[in-house]
Structure formats: structure tokens, C-alpha cells
């Protein structure tokens, strides 16, 4: 690296600075940035992030486990969307399970776990985040086929379950591929006196290019692709529903608008911050104030983005009438089972089997319905 050839003398006013032209490399930073203390930002995230992550973890686990349990009890007539929802709930559960580690990391201000844990957790975190986003894309496509392409729908969705399982496998595989760089670059290392679990690009020849590439992939698969599909699919779904003479169409439109708005509200701020970060990577004249602002914004918008996995069960599952009915039945039956064990005189066995059989007969008619969630 000695004697880098890149010369910044052309940037200087030649009449007075010719004698101090500096071989400033592409990775140089404005001197002020090294004096700019982001201590107050770190103090804020030390307090805010662990609380926020803990809440997201609790509610995310609760909501998504309930979705999984409901699917486990719901034996018949699983549509493609139902399979996607189940996978999304699993992805969200795995995702929120990594949050306590990050909460501890933020609270202590250092990575206190091993290098292997660092790689593993960053990997799980990335895989499940990407997987969740790609599954949202699949759900919007499935709803598009079911509602807009209603005439072709029976032909397109005749082999529903096998196809959706294959699609889910592809989604998980794609998520692993997208996230593979996370395993490679993320590592535990000491920087500025404390251990961190961060991507380390110093091993590659073009660190900033790699950083931009990784950010680009995150933005593409974690935001732009799902957004494009959602806008396309839901625009046509709303058009179709507006034209349809159906009493339930307004509720369906409201659900769709809620889904899109929540996605945008949660994802746009964080992805805008990522875009600004990417745009700033090569810049030297960043001000201390703007760095602090980006620091605060990044912390808050990241929490907002993660909040999405708590809202997924509400938006995609609990909002649906059928899903709520099944879920309430399961709760009643579980309560019933508990009561049965408590008082031997009281029997619920008949009611339990009756409920389950009624469930299956009710849904058998709608075997090819889009999903019991909408």
C-alpha cells in the first residue's frame, strides 16, 4: 500500500498548494469526522434499542407462535398463501430470536459473544429478514393470481400445496444465497478499544465497492423487489375488487391498503437511511451534525423496520375472519382441555372432536380459496 498513486493535487488550488499535494486515497475521510464524537448517539441506542428489541422479541414471538400453532391445528385446505404465512411466521420467529443478542450488544456497547456466534446470528438475521420479505412478495403474487386471474386461478393453483412448498424451498435457498456474504464478511474484531460484530471488508481489494454491493443487495431484495411486486399485484387486486359486486370487497380493500401502508411505513424510512449511507460512503466532506442525525435516524428506523415482523401476524393472519375463528376455537379447546384435567367430573372430549370436525367440514367447500386469512 505504500505510496499510493492516486493524487489529489488537482483538487487543490495549484498556486498555493502545489507543494503539499497529498496522495489521499479513496478511503480517506474528512479530519472532522474523526473528531466527531457519536457518543451521545451510542448512549441513546444503549437505552432505546434494548427496550425496543425486547418488546419486538416478546410480541413477535407471541404473534408468530400463535400463527404456527393455529396452522398446526388447522389440518385441511391449506392454500398457497397459508403455506407462505406459515413459512413467514417461522422466518419471523427465527429473526426475533436473534434480537436478544443484539439487545445485549447495544446495552453493553460491545460484542460479548464469540466470533462463531457473531457469524451465525448475523447470518440467521439476514436469511430470515430476506426470507420474510421474499415471502411477502409470494403472498402478493398468490393473491394476484387468486383474485385478478380468477379464471386461470383454478388451473394455475390446482397443484397448490406441492408448488407452494417448492416455492418456499426456493425462497429459503435464495435467502441463504443472498445472505452468504453476511457469513463471509461479518466477524468479531477489536476496533477502537472494544469488540464489535460487524462486516470487515479490509480482506478484499475494494472495500467500499463491496460495502456498496452488500448494501445494494440488502436494498434490492429486502425492499425494492417486494415493493415492486406489492405495488403491481395490489394495484390490480384493488382494481378487480372495485369492479366486483361483493359485499366483502370493502373489507378486502381495507386489508390490502393496510398491508401496503404498514409495509411502506416500516420499510421506507430504514431503506432511505441505507440509501443515504450508501451515497455518503465515498464522500469526504460529511459534517458532524449530519453524521449524528444519520446515527439517530438509523437506530430508530431499524427498530421500525423490525417492528414489521410483529405486525405480520396481525396483518396477514389475525385480520382474516376465518383465521380468527379457528384461532378462537383452538383457544377454547385448549381451555377446555385444561379444565378437563382440573375437574375430572367435567368432560370436553366430545365438544373438542365436534369442533375439529366442524372446522374441516366448514372449510372443505372453500378448498381452493385464496387463504383463510383474507
Amino acid at each position: 500500500m505504500s505510496g499510493e498513486s492516486m493524487n489529489f493535487s488537482d483538487v487543490f488550488d495549484s498556486s498555493e498548494d502545489y507543494f503539499v499535494s497529498v496522495n489521499t486515497s479513496y478511503y480517506s475521510v474528512d479530519s472532522e469526522m474523526l473528531l466527531c464524537s457519536l457518543q451521545e448517539v451510542r448512549q441513546f441506542s444503549r437505552l432505546f434499542v434494548p427496550i425496543a428489541y425486547s418488546l419486538i422479541c416478546v410480541f413477535g414471538l407471541l404473534g408468530n407462535i400463535l400463527v404456527v400453532i393455529t396452522f398446526a391445528f388447522y389440518k385441511k385446505a391449506r392454500s398457497m398463501t397459508d403455506v407462505y404465512l406459515l413459512n413467514m411466521a417461522i422466518a419471523d420467529i427465527l429473526f426475533v430470536l436473534t434480537l436478544p443478542f443484539w439487545a445485549v450488544s447495544h446495552a453493553t456497547g460491545a460484542w460479548v459473544f464469540s466470533n462463531a456466534t457473531c457469524k451465525l446470528l448475523k447470518g440467521i438475521y439476514a436469511i430470515n429478514f430476506n426470507c420474510g420479505m421474499l415471502l411477502l412478495t409470494c403472498i402478493s403474487m398468490d393473491r394476484y393470481i387468486a383474485i385478478v386471474q380468477a379464471t386461470k386461478s383454478f388451473r394455475l393453483r390446482s397443484r397448490t400445496l406441492p408448488r407452494s412448498k417448492i416455492i418456499c424451498l426456493v425462497v429459503w435457498g435464495l435467502s441463504v444465497i443472498i445472505s452468504s456474504s453476511t457469513f463471509v464478511f461479518n466477524q468479531k474484531y477489536n476496533t477502537q478499544g472494544s469488540d464489535v460484530c460487524e462486516p470487515k471488508y479490509q480482506t478484499v481489494s475494494e472495500p467500499i465497492r463491496w460495502k456498496l454491493l452488500m448494501l445494494g443487495l440488502e436494498l434490492l431484495f429486502g425492499f425494492f423487489i417486494p415493493l415492486m411486486f406489492m405495488i403491481f399485484c395490489y394495484t390490480f387486486i384493488v382494481k378487480t375488487l372495485v369492479q366486483a359486486q361483493n359485499s366483502k370487497r370493502h373489507k378486502a380493500i381495507r386489508v390490502i391498503i393496510a398491508v401496503v401502508l404498514v409495509f411502506l411505513a416500516c420499510q421506507i424510512p430504514h431503506n432511505m437511511v441505507l440509501l443515504v449511507t450508501a451515497a455518503n460512503l465515498g464522500k469526504m466532506n460529511r459534517s458532524c451534525q449530519s453524521e449524528k442525525l444519520i446515527g439517530y435516524t438509523k437506530t430508530v428506523t431499524e427498530v421500525l423496520a423490525f417492528l414489521h415482523c410483529c405486525l405480520n401476524p396481525v396483518l396477514y393472519a389475525f385480520i382474516g375472519q376465518k383465521f380468527r375463528n379457528y384461532f378462537l376455537k383452538i383457544l377454547k379447546d385448549l381451555w377446555c382441555v385444561r379444565r378437563k384435567y382440573k375437574s375430572s367430573g367435567f368432560s370436553c372430549a366430545g365438544r373438542y372432536s365436534e369442533n375439529i370436525s366442524r372446522q374441516t367440514s366448514e372449510t372443505a367447500d372453500n378448498d381452493n380459496a385464496s387463504s383463510f386469512t383474507m
Epitope: 480517506s28 474528512d30 479530519s31 472532522e32 473528531l35
Partner: antibody, heavy 117, light 112 residues
């Protein structure tokens, strides 16, 4: 021409105040940070602080906070370091230096000798 | 504050010899952004310091290629392949990874 022109020798009594100046070229003044470094006879260098005239931001070594104030005058492209409550410990050569990137000082003034007695 | 320690404090050399100056920091100088902000200066008697090398190993324009810098983390070295008379003076290492910026006490390069 010299890019950083510092004021000459400064003499002051203990407890008094003194203001050292450093004149930069317009380009340096508008584009970079200007720092002050202290050197006592036969000793090493000590960073006092830096001022960024374009934003007006100042950064100080905690050791001198309250003792030193850095200011900039846009009309004369000059930066100043003002001392208050001088003691014999403040006797030293003070260098003004340009800090463009990465926190290094690539060009230094000739130094101002401050004597407190 | 980060303490920068030089060794040796004085280095007597013959002209044409190789000289090696070591600098050790009390904390790692690897910044969170991946760069290491360690710089070398030379101060000749009665003069202001002059920057030789910035960010461990990058020579300033006009600095002869007999000067080279290396190291990482907390251990850094400045090498002069063939010492010339104009190289004599006090060499300082400095770090800007941490606030405040700090300098080493210096190594005096002198004729044997």
C-alpha cells in the same frame, strides 16, 4: 508564499489572557480544519484542539477545555487561540497546522513562542 | 487518552545504514470504519514538524521512497532504508483514531 502565517513571540504575565493568531490561505481556510499543537522545550507534541471555519465547529482536548478558546475570522481568513488565566505551564511553542483528511497535519505554521513570566 | 510509546528514544546510525523506529499504542488504532489512523512526522532542529507518512503506510507526495511505514493494531514501524544527512531529527508517531489526537514522545535519529 507561506500557507500558515503565525503571530510572533508573545509575552504575558501569569493570570493574564493572550490571543495567538494564524493566517491561512483562503482555500485552506474554507476547505479544511486548522489545529493547534503545543510543544514544550525538549518535549513531545500535544494536541490542543481544532476549528473548522466552514462550519464553525470546534473540538478541544479535555485537558484544555475552559482554558483555551478557538475562533475564526472569515474576513481575514485567520484563526485564533485565546488563553485565559495563564500559568507558567502554558509557556511553550504553539504550532498552527492544517488538517485536511484522516486527522493528519500536512502543513504547519512556523510556530509562536509564548512565554508566561 | 491513547498513549504512544516510541522505541528507541535515541537511534545512532551511520549514513547509508537502515534505521527502524518503533511506535506502540496503548489501544488498537483500527477505526470502526476499517482504517488505521497512524501517522509519522519528522521535526528537524528549530523547524516545524513535517508529515512523512499518513495512515500507516502512505507516503506524502515528495517524500523519498526510502521511507516506508508498516504495522497494524497497536504496533507500528517506520523504516528508512538508507539514512541520509537530511533525515536526521526527531521522528514522532501520531494517532487520530481516538479523541484526543495524541503524539508519541519521539525518537531522535542521530549520527553515530
Amino acid at each position: 508564499q507561506d500557507q500558515l502565517q503565525q503571530s510572533g513571540v508573545a509575552l504575558a504575565r501569569p493570570g493574564a489572557s493572550v490571543k495567538l493568531s494564524c493566517k491561512a490561505s483562503e482555500y485552506t481556510f474554507k476547505s479544511f480544519g486548522l489545529g493547534w499543537v503545543k510543544q514544550r522545550p525538549g518535549q513531545g507534541l500535544e494536541w490542543i484542539g481544532e476549528i473548522y471555519p466552514r462550519s464553525g465547529n470546534t473540538y478541544y482536548n479535555e485537558k484544555v477545555k475552559g482554558k483555551v478558546r478557538l475562533t475564526a475570522d472569515k474576513s481575514s481568513n485567520s484563526v485564533y487561540m485565546e488563553f485565559r488565566s495563564l500559568t507558567s505551564e502554558d509557556s511553550a511553542v504553539y504550532f498552527c497546522a492544517r488538517s485536511p483528511y484522516d486527522g493528519y497535519f500536512d502543513y504547519w505554521g512556523q510556530g509562536t513562542t509564548l512565554t508566561v513570566s | 487518552d491513547v498513549v504512544m510509546t516510541h522505541s528507541p528514544l535515541s537511534l545512532p546510525v551511520s549514513l547509508g545504514d537502515q534505521a527502524s523506529i518503533s511506535c506502540r499504542s496503548s489501544q488498537s488504532l483500527l477505526h470502526i470504519n476499517g482504517n488505521t489512523y497512524l501517522h509519522w512526522y519528522l521535526q528537524k532542529p528549530g523547524q516545524s514538524p513535517k508529515l512523512l507518512i499518513y495512515r500507516v503506510s502512505n507516503r506524502l507526495s515528495g517524500v523519498p521512497d526510502r521511507f516506508s511505514g508498516s504495522g497494524s493494531g497497536t504496533d507500528f514501524t517506520l523504516k528508512i532504508s538508507r539514512v541520509e544527512a537530511e533525515d536526521l531529527g526527531v521522528y514522532f508517531c501520531s494517532q487520530s483514531t481516538h479523541v484526543p489526537r495524541t503524539f508519541g514522545g519521539g525518537t531522535k535519529l542521530e549520527i553515530k
